[in-house]
């Protein structure tokens, strides 16, 4: 997760847009990835690379467990 | 309306440091980045850098050398700009700006004049 | 660091006719075909008033003599028809990224 991450922030060279999407990192199990962008006010770009960064990680981490539970099986 | 009002004149020697204020208004004061500006006498537009006040994010011209802070304190709507160790080339106006979009500076301040002199 | 090239440094001008000033980047400031530079027009004692954002988008109040264009690393500010208020200093200026770099300016008189 960490390594796609980094890869993703590192095309965005403003360091506002490059938080905004470590931001969307975070997890938050009571919203989605578009209800917490849509609170953002600071410009699209921010919304943007928020959005990209929350649903690559909500995805890996979605395939991660799905993984664990086949393991489990 | 927007506005962003700037503190007066100053005039401080060298070695000493500068604080300039920015008291932001006709906005939601958290919403948009501000930036710091300078221009020398006869010379053109400097970036020192900028803070999102919602989150505190800063980041600074690497030409201050560590020399620049910038703060907020969103209870009264002002940003703040710290120079220190003043040197005499360090004379100039000193501007605040309110970014849109993460784009373009569509609001400046008057601009404060510092002075720097033995 | 991004440096932005301003040209010419200082121009003359008569009343009617067309200003053109370029503004080079030393590298693309195209993000997925957004164009982060913008023009700001500056007359002495007062701070910088923004022109045109986006290369070529002209801000509200902004009289349509003045125009952008230009993308990737060229762009263009063009005055036409000057008129004598727009003797003042231009600046171009670019928020691709970190550090926010300023072009040297371009001092327009009119004749």
């Known amino acids: 997760l960490q390594e796609k991450i980094e890869e993703i922030a590192a095309k965005y060279k403003h360091l506002v847009v490059k938080k905004c999407c470590y931001d969307g990192v975070r997890i938050n199990h009571d919203e989605t990835c578009e209800q917490r962008a849509a609170r953002i006010s600071v410009g699209p770009r921010c919304v943007k690379a928020f959005t990209e960064c929350c649903v690559v990680a909500s995805q890996l981490r979605a395939n991660n467990s799905h993984k664990d539970l086949q393991l489990g099986r | 309306q927007v506005q962003l009002v700037q503190s007066g004149a100053e005039v401080k020697k060298p070695g000493s440091s500068v604080k300039v204020s920015c008291k932001a208004s006709g906005y939601t004061f958290t919403d948009h980045i501000i930036h710091w500006m300078r221009q020398a006498p006869g010379q053109g537009l400097e970036w020192m850098g900028y803070i999102y006040p919602r989150e505190g994010w800063t980041n600074y011209n690497e030409n201050f050398k560590g020399r620049v802070t910038i703060t907020a304190d969103k209870s009264t709507s002002t940003a703040y700009m710290e120079l220190s160790s003043l040197r005499s080339e360090d004379t100039a106006v000193y501007y605040c700006?309110?970014?849109?979009?993460?784009?373009?500076?569509?609001?400046w301040g008057q601009g404060t004049t510092v002075t720097v002199s033995s | 660091d991004i440096v932005l090239t301003q040209s010419p440094a200082s121009l003359a001008v008569s009343p009617g006719q067309r200003a053109t000033i370029t503004c080079k980047a030393s590298?693309?400031?195209?993000?997925?075909?957004?164009?982060?530079m913008n023009w700001y027009q500056q007359k002495p004692g007062q701070p910088p008033k923004l022109l045109i954002y986006a290369a070529s988008n002209l801000d509200s109040g902004v009289p349509a003599r003045f125009s952008g264009s230009g993308s990737g690393t060229d762009f263009t500010l063009t005055i036409n028809p000057v008129e004598a208020e727009d003797t003042a200093n231009y600046y171009c200026q670019q928020s691709n990224e970190d550090p926010y770099t300023f072009g040297g300016g371009t001092k327009v008189e009119i004749k």
């Open positions: 700006a309110r970014e849109r979009n993460l784009e373009y500076f569509d609001y």
């Open positions: 590298q693309s400031v195209d993000y997925e075909g957004f164009n982060y």
